[in-house]
Amino acid sequence: MKVLQEPTCVSDYMSISTCEWKMNGPTNCSTELRLLYQLVFLLSEAHTCIPENNGGAGCVCHLLMDDVVSADNYTLDLWAGQQLLWKGSFKPSEHVKPRAPGNLTVHTNVSDTLLLTWSNPYPPDNYLYNHLTYAVNIWSENDPADFRIYNVTYLEPSLRIAASTLKSGISYRARVRAWAQCYNTTWSEWSPSTKWHNSYREPFEQH
């Protein structure tokens, strides 16, 4: 049994880091493998992660952490029984994938303005809380070409757009994702999408 692709890990910078790797053949990850991880910190103890299958030869493990600060560094040991297959380290602050925003809501009752709001996925005491920026994706269910991205570079988790920038009388969907420039993170996953029917009063033409 050998490791074909070494573990790579990403952290949500809160409580979970996810490590993925591939073995050289079909593997029952949960029964055959264990990933031991330990914070490089005086008196800390090792923890064991039981991996799950992620495709025939792929494994994934979700490492639980109390919290994360920038100086944290973890040792990682991948074991198959008594055999050490791989040894490495992981610094969560250098491999951050933020949590996805939640509770995306479209408010359509504000005079021909669409107000989209969502929730910051971090608590106020987390460093990323004040460092997220967002991308909002809006698309038409009827017309695949009607697909747009709005970059929200301010901290407030909201976006206002004129309803008239979208077509009237059809349904749209929206979703939002986040990233943090300070840690050069990857983008989060997209939030669940929300749907609304876009309608607004066309202005009367003057003749």
């Epitope: 914070l39 490089v40 910190f41 005086l42 800390s44 109390d66 919290d67 600060v69 100086a71 944290d72």
Partner: nanobody, 115 residues
Framework: QVQLVESGGGLVQPGGSLRLSCAAS?????MAWFRQAPGKEREAVAT????????YYADSVKGRFTISRDNSKNTVYLQMNSLKAEDTAVYYC???????????WGQGTLVTVSS
């Protein structure tokens, strides 16, 4: 120059309690308490990470000692309960920029547990 100022040591009866404190002139990733009993090597007793949520203890003090820190004051505390004669030692505060926690040391404060 980093300074660590310890206080709170003294004489206490077995089963009693003491609270040690250590004020640091700076913010550190790791803050710790070590102890050295007469004729023995210095050993780590408890450590705490920046942010103060993660704490770690030597087996010999688990359930009896509690480490905490006040980040606004750069101060670390060690609450010692149910003290035993074998806890008698000079207790040292130490801080570190990494998880080794040994960059700077305090001068030590003597804790004597005796009836």
């Amino acid at each position: 120059q980093v300074q660590l100022v310890e206080s709170g040591g003294g004489l206490v009866q077995p089963g009693g309690s003491l609270r040690l404190s250590c004020a640091a002139s700076g913010d550190f990733y790791c803050m710790a308490w070590f102890r050295q009993a007469p004729g023995k090597e210095r050993e780590a007793v408890a450590t705490i990470r920046s942010g103060g949520r993660s704490t770690y203890y030597a087996d010999s003090v688990k359930g009896r000692f509690t480490i905490s820190r006040d980040n606004s004051k750069n101060t670390v505390y060690l609450q010692m309960n149910s003290l035993k004669a074998e806890d008698t030692a000079v207790y040292y505060c130490a801080v570190g920029v990494d998880g080794n926690c040994r960059n700077y040391w305090g001068q030590g404060t003597l804790v004597t547990v005796s009836s």
